[in-house]
Amino acid sequence: MMTGTIETTGNISAEKGGSIILQCHLSSTTAQVTQVNWEQQDQLLAICNADLGWHISPSFKDRVAPGPGLGLTLQSLTVNDTGEYFCIYHTYPDGTYTGRIFLEVLESSVAEHGARFQIP
């Protein structure tokens, strides 16, 4: 039985032109993480393999940076980056765990305005 749970940053918003960190954390399992895939809809952004390290997809090399940790940093955000992102943890012996993050990229003034009214 798979006992683990994935905690994510959930629904997040960021400013156009800025950057954002996508973070997931796997807990409540002794399973060993062998690889984490980061995907946007059906597109592979990056892979972090426990043995081979990071691989960033060529089409995202300019705007995606590995880390911190198993997370992923998206830079030079555009409105087109709005959407769902998935962290896919490949583990042994549990198998695959998937976490979902929704990112909304806002025009600068909207993002600033929204930030004032965020619930802490």
Partner: antibody, heavy 115, light 105 residues
């Protein structure tokens, strides 16, 4: 290339102890769990459990709790299976296998328990 | 613990024949892996994660299925395919099927 090399055949008497080794090479040892599988003559495969090579924490399948112990010598990239108080029914081939979808297995270590 | 049942236990096939080996799970599993084992050797991975062909495995082997029913198909049996075949799942508590012995007529 990736290899798992196990120790040689063992002939033991009931009540004795055996320690089977599995030396890994060609990859970062602590990146993948190591599991152990038992195969009795002419029978199928039975998962015994696994050890997290990063944390050193072992997990045993229900039928292998008590007399069985998994351990590591991380500096030598080696995993061990120890069986205490051997019984005739422990006669089998024991495989180590890397915990991923790569399909990497040791060649098997044959244990014969006989008085 | 998920019990895997393979059928048939023994199968006899002619050269060039297409055959399908099945593996049913007592409860739903996300992925199935298939191994081939010849006498005196360690199991060899054929298919991983239900339908992916392992490196170096001939394309006559294929896998499919979902939930509680999975299958391994050999599109055109060759003499070297005589072996035992096992399905294997993880899902927290790994288990193997009882195996299917493939004999060539």
């Amino acid at each position: 290339q990736i290899q798992l090399v196990q120790s040689g055949p063992e002939l033991k008497k009931p009540g004795e102890t055996v320690k089977i080794s599995c030396k890994a090479s060609g990859y970062t040892f602590t990146a993948y769990g190591m599991s152990w599988v038992k195969q009795t003559p002419g029978k199928g495969l039975k998962w015994m459990g696994w050890i997290n090579t990063y944390s050193g924490v072992p997990t045993y399948a229900d039928d292998f709790k008590g007399r069985f112990a998994f351990s590591l010598e991380t500096s030598a990239s080696t995993a061990y299976l120890q069986i205490n108080n051997l019984k005739n029914e422990d006669t089998a081939t024991y495989f180590c296998t890397r915990g991923d979808t790569g399909g990497y297995w040791g060649q098997g270590a044959t244990l014969t328990v006989s008085s | 613990q998920i019990v895997l049942t393979q059928s048939p236990a023994i199968m006899s096939a002619s050269l060039g024949e297409e055959i399908t080996l099945t593996c049913s799970a007592r409860s739903s599993v996300s992925d199935m892996h298939w191994y081939q084992q010849k006498s005196g050797t360690s199991p060899k991975l054929l298919i991983y994660s239900t339908s992916n062909l392992a490196s170096g495995v001939p394309s006559r082997f294929s896998g499919s299925g979902s939930g509680t029913f999975f299958s391994l198909t050999i599109s055109s049996v060759e003499a070297e395919d005589a072996a035992d075949y096992y399905c294997h799942q993880w899902g927290g508590y790994p288990t193997f099927g009882g195996g299917t012995k493939l004999e060539i007529k």
